[in-house]
Structure formats: structure tokens, C-alpha cells
């Protein structure tokens, strides 16, 4: 029997394969057969593709015909067109190549016709009855990438045997499509099986690097082992991994079990699964899923605070009723005046100091001081009355430096020392009022909106910190923050701002400006149009003073009565942000065309300004950020925690705004 007729064979390039199946089939049967294997009948549209078909078919007998993917319905002649009215089975008539056996004749085309390729000579195209069972058919398979054929090694017992995803087995391949398997038999007896897989860095490649057939010892190339090579009694080698790593499926490389571990916070190698998950202080493992961590409500513990307690995610705060001040222990309350202002300000520094260098702190504040840019012609909003109390905000991080954010004045002044709220770069915390203590610079006037520091050290994909959501169970519902979830791309490339999309995380290619999608909030007629932000700009966050319902997950709208907009005028494309509230039409902000996304300078001078990711790096190499609210999906989420507006607030000229007190508070984040 001639090899032409024996077995199917294929010829593959880097992005597609042609396969010849010498099986007698009608056109429809052939089409189905290709489709069942994940391909289509061959569509050689270019001279290059035709050349690959020619080399695959070879010099077959003239009597043999092979279906290709061209068909024409009855009375559909278009003789002047290259395909003569025929259509590729992919549904189009595009082609840069034809190989008709005869010039077009002016017949009436009364019947459906299909095209077969001659196996001999120049592999001309012939038309004929689609129901005729010709000698075979040509399939075409497209794919995302291909692996090159393996190089023969000295220790191999024979050529590698490849199996493609369309079930073709052969040793004769130059390229192997994604999903192919290579079986290599070694002279020493053992063989290797490799898979053509997607590589983490992009593209495709073999699941294992050579050498596949190793010598009898560890001496050449460490026996192919990534970590440790052990020579067995029979002369073969086996690989071992150093502590904290486990042997990968290929038996050669080592993998960090925590790299892919689904731990929400901290991961430790070891245990039955190769890793175990742990939660930071202030959190405990979720009962339904030990990979997740849930907040411990310390306020449920009797006597945790002398007077009042507010639990938040990862911590809690004690505060005191009117006329009392929190003592240095952070728990007890004493009558007002019994403790000086300085003592109140320093309570976290003395009681809960985590060892941060004070000079570094001051440097960070100096870097922030003066980082204001004048913003002419913008209507700012201010609270109904100035605050009459002091607040110590203590953002808590497991980092050496804490980026701070200027906090707005409140819309409501509760007669309490308000709780401290943890801050993360992914969280715009505009929920509570603050007053700057004497040791820190005061804020500029109402016409000088701040620039938010947002340039952070680069984090690996595995160590990105998603959002922590503060909750306030003890506060009246009117004062609880609304929630807006905004997807956060996993890691923006260098020189690119964080990518924010309300619906599509990780859609922005490298060096391309992120776009805020149009958002509409039902009932409020709030429309936010934000332009693409150039790579040297960070995204603008616009704070609107409309009374919005809290159930607006897709809207990029920050709700507060007294929030400053961090904006710098530039020559960038215009930004239009409008908000119409059915309740208070006076709460409209019109941002002029000159008003543009802010460049966000860093408060972390020692960190690289090129990566704008979350500012938190875990202390443990395998620790992961808490993900609250937890959502399934490929990337961490950015949640904006926003206050409910005060029912009676009205816009007036903005007064002095306050910065958070600068001190470390909560060792629960360590």
C-alpha cells in the first residue's frame, strides 16, 4: 500500500496545521469530520498556504481527490470573481489565491457544487458533486501558538512521537500546535512526556526543558534538576527540592506551593496540600473556607473598651463620649482636659509603635507638604459647620512607610472622638473628618485642591493587596459608608497609572491609557465620562456631592458633601463629570475642559515611581492581601468606601481641610 493512502498526516506552521485524511467521504461528511476535531476544511487563501498544502499532499496519484473548504449553492455563479461564486466554509469569499483546473465557463450553474483538489501534479481545484465520496479531505486547524519540534538528544532511543490535539500521531512535525504531547523514549529505559503549553511570560512552549534523556549521574547539568540532584542506586537520578518548595509534575523543576495557593492573607509552605493558610491578627479563618479570612469583631469581647467601641476590618477603636478623651492606653476614657492635646496625638506612637524610624516619617510628610497645585474656577463644597473635635486617623500597613491622604472636613460633627479608619491605596477613605495636629502642616485654602500620593512600589502579581473594607456596625445607617466596587487591574506596567474599570479588570494592554467606562446610576442621572489617561498621569477621582443611593456598583461616583478633588490642570483631553440629583439640583459640579487627571506624586521617596500598584508589601513573602469583599475573578478588586451624605448639607465655600494624624496605630496588620 502506498503511504499516501495509509494514515492521516499533517504539516504545521507556527499558527496553523493542515492535515490530510485519506478517508473516503462526501463533502458534508468531510466538513463534519474536520469540525469534530476542532478544525475546518482547508481554506488555502494565499500562495504560502497553498505551498504548505502542496508539500503535504505531495506527488499523489492523479486519480485521488481531496475535499477543500469551498462550496457554491445552485445558481450562484459569479464567474468574474476569483472564487466564481464559491464560498469558503468559514463563510467568506476572501482569497489571494486560486488554482482552478479550467478557465471559467459560462454555464448556468444549476446545482450545488463543491471543490476538490487533485492529489497529483499542480494540485488543481476541480468542482463537482458535493455528494460524491472522494478519496479524502484536507482539514485546517488554527491555534494560538506552536512549539518547535524537539531536538534529538544523544540518549534518545528514537525520534519523539507527537500527538496533536486533532489526534494525529507522527514523528514528522516541524511545529506542534498548542496542546500537543511529545513522547520521548530514552535508551536508559525511562522516557519523558511533554506538553505544549502556554508559558507564563506569554507564547507557548514545552512543559519541560531538556535534556530529557539524562546521563547516568548528576554531573551533566545537575541531572536536569532545578534544585537538588540525587543519584539512585540503579544509576538513575531523582530530583529534590529545598525546604519550602515541592517537586513539579515534570519531576525536575521545583515550585513554590504558595505561588499558586489561594490564601487570602498569608501562606506558609508545608502541610498536606503543600501549603497552609494563615490570617493576620484581627482576622480568623472563615468557617466555610479556610483559605479566606474574616474580620474578628473585637467589640464583642466584653470590656475591650471602657466606653464605646467601633470594630473595623482588621482592627477596632475605642472612643469616648462627649466631654471625655481617650487615654494613652487607647482603651480608657478620662474627663476632657485631664490629658493634653499632645498626649492624645501621640498615643499610638508610644503605645503601639511598630519600630518605624521617625525621621523617615517626617521625610514623608515633608515630601507631601507643598504638594498642592492651584485649581482655578472650580466650585468646592464644604460642610454645614466646622468640626469641633479632634480625630486621630491611623492608617495601618505592614510596610515601612505609610502613604497618607488628605482627608476632607465632615458633613456631620458627631460629639465623639471618632474611630480611626485603616487606609489602603485601593481605598479612597473619605468617610470621616480629621483635624491636623500641631506637628503637621495645615492644608491650603479652598482653591488649592490636593494631589493624592499614589505612586507605590511594584508588587509581584502574587503579592498584590486588594481592598480592605471598613465597616461600622455601631454607627447609625445614615453614617455608614456606601460601597462601590471598581475592578482594579492586577499590575499596571511601568509608566502607567493604575487601571480602573468598573466592569472589565485587566483589559488594558501595556502602555495604553485606561478608560473609565461610561457609567449611569439609575435614579440619579449621574453620568461620568472620563477620557483615556496618558501614561504619565494617574487616574482622576471625582467626588460628587449628590445624594446617591448606595446600590450603584457600576458607578464611578464618590459620594460625600465635603471632599476635595485632587486635580491638576493640564493640556490633556477634557473630562466631563456631571451629576444631577433629583433631591438637590444645586449639587452639580461642572469640571471645565482644562481640568484634567492628576499626576500623583509619591509620599514614598525611596520607592520606584514607575509602578503604581498597591502600596502594601506583605512582610511574609507568601502573605496575600485580604480580599474583602471577596469576588471570584482574576484580579483583586478596588473598592471605594464612601460616606452617605448628610441629609441637610448644602454647598458653600470650602474651608480649611484637614490631614490625617500621622502615626502608626494597629499592630494587627503586622
Amino acid at each position: 500500500q502506498d503511504p499516501w493512502a495509509a494514515e492521516p498526516r499533517a504539516a504545521c506552521g507556527p499558527s496553523s496545521c493542515y492535515a490530510l485524511f485519506p478517508r473516503r467521504r462526501t463533502f458534508l461528511e468531510a466538513w463534519r469530520a474536520c469540525r469534530e476535531l476542532g478544525g475546518d476544511l482547508a481554506t488555502p487563501r494565499t500562495p504560502e498556504e497553498a505551498q504548505r498544502v502542496d508539500s503535504l499532499v505531495g506527488a499523489g496519484p492523479a486519480s485521488r481527490l481531496l475535499w477543500i473548504g469551498l462550496q457554491r449553492q445552485a445558481r450562484q455563479c459569479q464567474l468574474q470573481r476569483p472564487l466564481r461564486g464559491f464560498t469558503w466554509t468559514t463563510g467568506d469569499q476572501d482569497t489571494a489565491f486560486t488554482n482552478w483546473a479550467q478557465p471559467a465557463s459560462g454555464g448556468p450553474c444549476p446545482a450545488q457544487r463543491c471543490v476538490a483538489l487533485e492529489a497529483s501534479g499542480e494540485h488543481r481545484w476541480l468542482e463537482g458533486s458535493c455528494t460524491l465520496a472522494v478519496d479524502g479531505y484536507l482539514c485546517q486547524f488554527g491555534f494560538e501558538g506552536a512549539c518547535p519540534a524537539l531536538q534529538d538528544e544523544a540518549g534518545q532511543a528514537g525520534p519523539a512521537v507527537y500527538t496533536t490535539p486533532f489526534h494525529l500521531v507522527s514523528t514528522e512535525f516541524e511545529w506542534l500546535p498548542f496542546g500537543s504531547v511529545a513522547a520521548v523514549q530514552c535508551q536508559a529505559g525511562r522516557g519523558a512526556s511533554l506538553l505544549c503549553v502556554k508559558q507564563p511570560e506569554g507564547g507557548v512552549g514545552w512543559s519541560r526543558a531538556g535534556p530529557l534523556c539524562l546521563g547516568t549521574g548528576c554531573s551533566p547539568d545537575n541531572g536536569g534538576c532545578e534544585h537538588e540532584c540525587v543519584e539512585e542506586v540503579d544509576g538513575h537520578v531523582s530530583c529534590r527540592c529545598t525546604e519550602g518548595f515541592r517537586l513539579a509534575a515534570d519531576g525536575r523543576s521545583c515550585e513554590d506551593p504558595c505561588a499558586q495557593a489561594p490564601c487570602e492573607q498569608q501562606c506558609e509552605p508545608g502541610g498536606p496540600q503543600g501549603y497552609s493558610c494563615h490570617c493576620r491578627l484581627g482576622f480568623r479563618p472563615a468557617e466555610d473556607d479556610p483559605h479566606r479570612c474574616v474580620d474578628t469583631d473585637e467589640c464583642q469581647i466584653a470590656g475591650v473598651c471602657q466606653q464605646m467601641c467601633v470594630n473595623y476590618v482588621g482592627g477596632f477603636e475605642c472612643y469616648c463620649s462627649e466631654g471625655h478623651e481617650l487615654e494613652a492606653d487607647g482603651i480608657s476614657c478620662s474627663p476632657a482636659g485631664a490629658m493634653g492635646a499632645q498626649a492624645s496625638q501621640d498615643l499610638g506612637d508610644e503605645l503601639l509603635d511598630d519600630g518605624e524610624d521617625e525621621e523617615d516619617e517626617d521625610e514623608a510628610w515633608k515630601a507631601f507638604n507643598g504638594g498642592w497645585t492651584e485649581m482655578p474656577g472650580i466650585l468646592w463644597m464644604e460642610p454645614t459647620q466646622p468640626p469641633d473635635f479632634a480625630l486621630a486617623y491611623r492608617p495601618s500597613f505592614p510596610e515601612d512607610r505609610e502613604p497618607q491622604i488628605p482627608y476632607p472636613e465632615p458633613t456631620w460633627p458627631p460629639p465623639l472622638s471618632a474611630p480611626r479608619v485603616p487606609y489602603h491605596s485601593s481605598v479612597l477613605s473619605v468617610t470621616r473628618p480629621v483635624v491636623v495636629s500641631a506637628t503637621h502642616p495645615t492644608l491650603p485654602s479652598a482653591h488649592q485642591p490636593p494631589v493624592i500620593p499614589a505612586t507605590h512600589p511594584a508588587l509581584s502579581r502574587d503579592h498584590q493587596i486588594p481592598v480592605i473594607a471598613a465597616n461600622y456596625p455601631d454607627l447609625p445607617s445614615a453614617y455608614q459608608p456606601g460601597i462601590l466596587s471598581v475592578s482594579h487591574s492586577a499590575q499596571p506596567p511601568a509608566h502607567q497609572p493604575p487601571m480602573i474599570s468598573t466592569k472589565y479588570p485587566e483589559l488594558f494592554p501595556a502602555h495604553q491609557s485606561p478608560m473609565f467606562p461610561d457609567t449611569r446610576v439609575a435614579g440619579t442621572q449621574t453620568t461620568t465620562h472620563l477620557p483615556g489617561i496618558p501614561p504619565n498621569h494617574a487616574p482622576l477621582v471625582t467626588t460628587l456631592g449628590a445624594q446617591l443611593p448606595p446600590q450603584a456598583p457600576d458607578a464611578l461616583v464618590l459620594r460625600t458633601q465635603a471632599t476635595q478633588l485632587p486635580i491638576i490642570p493640564t493640556a490633556q483631553p477634557s473630562l466631563t463629570t456631571t451629576s444631577r440629583s433629583p433631591v438637590s439640583p444645586a449639587h452639580q459640579i461642572s469640571v471645565p475642559a482644562a481640568t484634567q487627571p492628576a499626576a500623583l506624586p509619591t509620599l514614598l521617596p525611596s520607592q520606584s515611581p514607575t509602578n503604581q500598584t498597591s502600596p502594601i508589601s506583605p512582610t511574609h513573602p507568601h502573605s496575600k492581601a485580604p480580599q474583602i469583599p471577596r469576588e471570584d475573578g482574576p484580579s483583586p478588586k478596588l473598592a471605594l468606601w464612601l460616606p452617605s451624605p448628610a441629609p441637610t448639607a448644602a454647598p458653600t465655600a470650602l474651608g480649611e481641610a484637614g490631614l490625617a494624624e500621622h502615626s502608626q496605630r494597629d499592630d494587627r496588620w503586622l
Epitope: 500500500q1 502506498d2 499516501w4 493512502a5 473516503r24 462526501t26 496519484p61 492523479a62 486519480s63 485521488r64 481527490l65 482552478w100 483546473a101 479550467q102 478557465p103 465557463s105 444549476p110 446545482a111 450545488q112 457544487r113 476538490a116 487533485e118 497529483s120 476541480l126 468542482e127 463537482g128 458533486s129 458535493c130 455528494t131 460524491l132 465520496a133 472522494v134
Partner: antibody
Framework: QVQLVQSGPEVKKPGASVKLSCKAS????????IHWVKQAPGQRLEWMGY????????TYNQKFKGQVTITVDTSASTAYMELNSLRSEDTAVYYC?????????????????WGQGTLVTVSS | DIQLTQSPSFLSASVGDRVTITCRAS??????VAWYQQKPGKAPKLLIY???NRYTGVPSRFSGSGSGTEFTLTISSMQPEDLATYFC??????????FGQGTKLEIK
């Protein structure tokens, strides 16, 4: 020009065998499939089987399988059909025919050239 | 197997007459149908292939039409040399050819 010349008539007794020949000329022998067709008196034509001289690929009609063997000698550009265990109902004219590959840009499996036929008579 | 039925089995026509022979298939055969002419004591000759394509050298008075299960051979103007038996053949399930029983055309 294309020609298929068949061997002369045969008279055989029941149970005997006969081998018919079909010599091709005027074309490349290995480029075309050769079929054998039976025409019994008063009956319609019946396809018996084919051979592809390129690779000796053969296929038989189930009705004749076991009784018929088709072979080729490419060096002589000749196809053969052997009939075994002859019976009286095997009395017929046997034709060899060439299957066409393409005509004017059309592929088709009709039989474009036929031999003159060989009469086989089976009689005791 | 696919059965082919020709009608009529016998046909008398005068020179110059338009003659039509039909062939019905027991199932869809697309256009994989051929028509042959066999004169007494001779081998069949191909007239029409692929249901409607006239073979090289065949006079233009012969034409074929149809697809699926109904096929027609038409002689537009009967000539004395057209006296013969005409067969239809299907090959859609190639190589399993089947033939019609034949139509014998006589001259009146």
C-alpha cells in the same frame, strides 16, 4: 487515443475459474482507476469492483466478494479480473471501464472509457 | 443500496422528435449521475456526467438535468443513429455504482 482492449470470449464449466484481461493504452495507466462491470442477459449493469493501479488499492461489491479477484500488472498496463467457482448465472459480458478523474475542470466518477467487453459462458 | 428506476423501459420516437427519459433514485444522490448510450453489441459510451455536463464529443442535442432524486436525459431532436439503450448511473456512494435497468429507444 485512449483504448481499453479486453481478452476474447471464454466458455467454462461450472466450478471452474477464468481470468479476464484489460490492456490500457493512450494514457498513463497508474493515473486512473479501473472498474469491472457485469452485464448478464436481460439484466441491468452491475458494478463488481475496482483497482487503483497506482497503489493496488481494491474494493469489491459485497455481492461478488470472495468470488472475484482484481489485479494489475503496471509494467504491462494491464488489469485482470479472476472469477472463481463459476456458476451458470455468471454467464455474462464483463466490461472493464476507466473511471474519469476530471472533465473540463469538473471532477467526476463516471466511466469515460469502456473496453469492448468479454463474453463468459458457463455451461456444463 | 441506492436503486435507480428508469422510465419508460421502451420508447418509440420518430426522427426529429424530442425524447425525454427519466431516472428516479431511491434517495438523494446530489448530481452524481451519469447517462450512457449502448448500441447493440457494443460497450456503453458516456454521454452526460454530473447530471448535466455533456461529455467531450457528445452532440449538443443530448442534455441532462436534475438533482437529488429526479433526473432527465433529453434528446432535443431524435436522429437515426440515436437508436440504442440508455442507462442512468449513480455514484454518490462511490465506489458502489448502481445502474438503471435501461430504456430502449426505437425508431418509429
Amino acid at each position: 487515443q485512449v483504448q481499453l482492449v479486453q481478452s476474447g470470449p471464454e466458455v467454462k464449466k461450472p466450478g471452474a475459474s477464468v481470468k479476464l484481461s484489460c490492456k490500457a493504452s493512450g494514457y498513463t495507466f497508474t493515473d486512473y482507476v479501473i472498474h469491472w462491470v457485469k452485464q448478464a442477459p436481460g439484466q441491468r449493469l452491475e458494478w463488481m469492483g475496482y483497482i487503483n493501479p497506482y497503489d493496488d488499492d481494491t474494493t469489491y461489491n459485497q455481492k461478488f466478494k470472495g468470488q472475484v479477484t482484481i489485479t494489475v500488472d503496471t509494467s504491462a498496463s494491464t488489469a485482470y479480473m479472476e472469477l472463481n467457482s463459476l456458476r451458470s448465472e455468471d454467464t455474462a459480458v464483463y466490461y472493464c471501464a476507466r473511471r474519469g478523474n476530471s472533465y473540463d475542470g469538473y471532477f467526476d466518477y463516471s466511466m469515460d472509457y469502456w473496453g469492448q467487453g468479454t463474453l463468459v459462458t458457463v455451461s456444463s | 443500496d441506492i436503486q435507480l428506476t428508469q422510465s419508460p423501459s421502451f420508447l418509440s420516437a420518430s426522427v426529429g422528435d424530442r425524447v425525454t427519459i427519466t431516472c428516479r433514485a431511491s434517495q438523494n444522490v446530489g448530481t452524481a449521475v451519469a447517462w450512457y448510450q449502448q448500441k447493440p453489441g457494443k460497450a456503453p459510451k458516456l454521454l452526460i456526467y454530473s447530471a448535466s455536463n455533456r461529455y467531450t464529443g457528445v452532440p449538443s442535442r443530448f442534455s441532462g438535468s436534475g438533482s437529488g432524486t429526479e433526473f432527465t436525459l433529453t434528446i432535443s431532436s431524435m436522429q437515426p443513429e440515436d437508436l440504442a439503450t440508455y442507462f442512468c448511473q449513480q455514484y454518490t456512494n462511490y465506489p458502489m455504482y448502481t445502474f438503471g435497468q435501461g430504456t430502449k429507444l426505437e425508431i418509429k
